[in-house]
């Protein structure tokens, strides 16, 4: 009566747990009473008519992690108290029709990780209780109209990891109480204008890792509850005007690994929770006057790895609570002095593998909390007085691999980082390129008296965008740093320091953040 | 293996300033964002604060904001947690977990420090 | 701020009962909520994640379910070693708040 299987568990009958590659049928006889029936990792290649039959009060049902490919129309016939239903894992390429009929109290239907190649509108007809459909990492390569039709409670669709190349405008249209839609890492080119305007309810969408190429203009207008929305890795070009201007709860965007050349003015509507924005392996080329004024509470903008050429004095306006920048690994020749005038709280900019050749005296003018700051590999020859002065947090500066010229000009930026060394770190030190007798010396300890007068030498290499040094510029990345002991150089060593700018001692040796975005 | 060691948790009196740390290993530490959590003595669970992948992103709870400064240094695969103006009520347990999540719906902190304890007492 | 309620607040169970948590959440938070055990002087330990998935390691009797409100943490047959308290925790929306806990103990 309360028999158990000798193949399987029971926990006071109720619970059953049937695990091991011996068992190729479903045990015999179950317990009655059985509420909770696991068979796992078995050798079971198929489920027979009514195997479940005796159990009718089973309310959570895995059968997963089997060899299980074949399954007769009604092999959960009498299930009528099941709310959990999981197939994952398994080998089925078809499902029955019918399969899921009198499945009334079915809350969780999972069958993902299969070899399913088609649904049908008749195969969820029946479920109309489902909250929950996990269909991912299947072979399907479309979604007929009608198939999710009936299942008007579903919060959690989770499409993703299939072979999906069009989504029709009409197949979630009924599901007004979706939460959940995930579409990720399928082939979808296109989503057709209309076909998330049901999805009212719709908190994350996941269209990551797809080839799409076009967003219609009102695509998400109708899902103000949006709060993640995944758009990473397709092959989007340009975002419509008004894309996501109606998006306030939105806490996370991805739009990295796209082919975006442009950014129009106010294309990021007001999102008031989102904190960072990635935007890096783009094709982005420029940056307008107050192309993310809505972002507030912006913290960290990842702008790496484009082709921007240039920056509109106005491009970061209300960007007030900005603390991380990231522009490295584009094509940067110059900035305006006042483009980083309004980032009051940054504490972290990249600018690495640029081509920047010189910078303006006032560049960090009003960003008095900058930490880091990553200039390597660039095309300076030489900065302008006192830039660093007024930075008092100051603790990482990278300056190497760029084609210092070091001449006379150059003595007021070797005196300050003579009294800086920690700041450089002593992985990479900044060497002189100009003129030929100094080449190759650490612009630190060059001799003075071997400087010559300020002479402009023609000698400026254009350094390829891959160049010879180890490549840092991967994202996340974080510039390794060394400890900060201080370099041994006395002062009596060097010949003409009458032109040292003493600052003052701000003992920031010991600050330990050191992120580059 | 994967782990996460806290440090810094000592006796202090009210109004006073501490300075925790949380040492990471087996895992790329600069790929992940690091959180804060703190269990009074008796108590539930309190998220404080949490860090992204790079240090940019910082977000903390009410409760502390203002007072608390959480930082990391991905060098050093170490994160951090100034505390400053220090109250009773801030005695706990403090936990660093590390706080895993991905665009296929995985939110999770999955690996979590043994603690640290804090006593704000006169 | 979003608010987690748990009940029980405690509950006494015989190994092998079913037992059921619930977390109901102030305002819908989709699937993203995670449960945790914590045993005395240890630390928590992650058990689901986006509502249902089973975290890596942890023993296929823990399931969850549930989105937007309303989720349930089931253990399907209680061991010896699941007496505990267990936490839920949102991650929709900052502060990412946690539940107030239920204690599992023996009956």
């Known amino acids: 009566y309360y028999g158990c299987p000798s193949e399987c568990t029971c926990s006071r009958a109720s619970q059953v747990e049937c695990t091991g590659a011996r068992i190729v049928a479903v045990p015999t006889p179950l317990p009655w009473n059985a509420m909770s029936l696991q068979i796992l990792n078995t050798h079971i290649t198929e489920l027979s008519e009514s195997p479940f039959l005796n159990i009718s009060a089973l309310i959570a049902l895995r059968i997963e992690k089997n060899e299980l490919s074949h399954i007769m129309p009604g092999a959960f016939r009498n299930l009528g108290s099941l709310r959990y239903l999981s197939l994952a894992n398994n080998k089925l390429q078809v499902l029955p029709i019918g399969l899921f009929q009198g499945l009334d109290s079915l809350e969780s239907l999972l069958l993902s990780s299969n070899q399913l190649v088609q649904i049908q509108p008749a195969h969820f007809s029946q479920c109309s209780n489902l909250k929950e459909l996990q269909l991912h990492g299947n072979h399907l390569e479309y979604i007929p109209d009608g198939a999710f039709d009936h299942l008007v409670g579903l919060t959690k669709l989770n499409l993703g990891k299939n072979s999906l190349t069009h989504i029709s405008p009409r197949v979630f249209q009924h599901l007004g109480n979706l939460q959940v839609l995930r579409l990720y890492e399928n082939r979808l080119t296109d989503i057709p204008m209309g076909t998330f305007d049901g999805l009212v309810n719709l908190q994350e969408l996941a269209l990551q890792q797809n080839q799409i190429g076009l967003l219609s203009p009102g695509l998400f207008h109708n899902n103000h509850n949006l709060q993640r929305l995944y758009l990473s890795n397709n092959h989007i070009s340009q975002l419509p005007p008004s894309i996501f201007m109606q998006l306030p709860q939105l806490n996370r965007l991805t739009l990295f690994g796209n082919s975006l050349k442009e950014l129009s003015p106010g294309i990021f509507g007001p999102m008031p929770n989102l904190r960072e924005l990635w935007l890096y392996d783009n094709h982005i080329t420029s940056l307008p006057d107050n192309v993310f004024s809505n972002l507030r509470q912006l913290q960290v903008l990842i702008l790496s790895r484009n082709q921007i050429s240039f920056i509109s004095p106005g491009a970061f306006n209300g960007l007030t609570e900005l603390r991380e920048l990231s522009l490295h690994t584009n094509a940067l020749q110059d900035l305006d002095g006042n483009v980083f005038r309004m980032l009051a709280n940054l504490q972290n900019i990249s600018l690495q593998n640029n081509r920047l050749r010189q910078l303006p005296g006032n560049i960090f003018a009003n960003v008095n909390g900058l930490m880091t700051i990553q200039l390597q590999n660039n095309q300076l020859e030489n900065l302008p007085l006192g830039i660093f002065d007024h930075l008092g947090k100051l603790c990482e500066l990278r300056l190497y691999d760029n084609p210092w010229r070091c001449d006379s000009d150059i003595l007021p930026l070797r005196n300050w980082l003579l009294l800086n060394q920690p700041r450089l770190g002593t992985d990479t030190v900044p060497v002189c390129f100009s003129p030929a007798n100094v080449r190759g010396q650490s612009l630190i300890i060059i001799n003075v008296n071997v400087a010559v007068p300020s002479v402009h030498v023609p000698e400026v290499p254009s350094y390829p965008e891959t160049s010879w040094y180890p490549d840092t510029s991967s994202y996340p990345d974080t510039t390794s740093i060394s400890s900060t002991t201080e370099l041994t150089s006395p002062v009596e060593d060097y010949t003409d320091l009458t032109t040292i700018q003493v600052t003052d001692d701000r003992s920031v040796w010991g600050m330990t953040q050191a992120q580059s975005g | 293996q994967v782990q996460l060691v806290e440090s810094g948790g000592d006796l202090v009196t009210p109004g006073g300033s501490l300075r925790l740390s949380c040492a990471a290993s087996g895992f790329t530490f600069s790929d992940y964002y690091m959180t804060w959590i703190r269990q009074a003595p008796g108590k539930g669970l309190e998220w404080i604060s949490d860090i992204g992948s790079s240090g940019g992103s910082v977000d903390y709870a009410d409760s502390v904001k203002g007072r608390f400064t959480i930082s990391r240094d991905n060098a050093k695969n170490s994160l951090y947690l100034q505390m400053s103006s220090l109250r009773a009520e801030d005695t706990a347990v403090y936990y660093c977990?590390?706080?895993?999540?991905?665009?296929?719906?995985?939110?999770?902190?999955?690996?979590w420090g043994q603690g640290t304890m804090v006593t704000v007492s006169s | 701020e979003i608010v987690l309620t748990q009940s029980p607040s405690s509950l006494s169970a015989s190994v092998g009962d079913r037992v059921t948590i619930k977390c109901r959440a102030s305002?819908?938070?989709?699937?993203?909520l995670a449960w945790y055990q914590q045993k005395p002087g240890k630390a928590p330990k992650l058990l689901i994640y986006d509502a249902s998935s089973l975290e890596s390691g942890v023993p296929s009797g823990f399931s969850g379910s549930g989105s937007g409100t309303d989720f349930t943490l089931t253990i399907s047959s209680l061991q010896p070693e699941d007496f505990a308290t267990y936490y839920c925790?949102?991650?929709?929306?900052?502060?990412?708040?946690f539940g107030p806990g239920t204690k599992v103990d023996i009956k």
């Open positions: 305002q819908g938070i989709s699937s993203a």
């Open positions: 925790q949102q991650f929709n929306s900052y502060p990412h708040t």
């Open positions: 977990a590390r706080y895993n999540w991905n665009d296929r719906g995985y939110d999770g902190f999955d690996i």
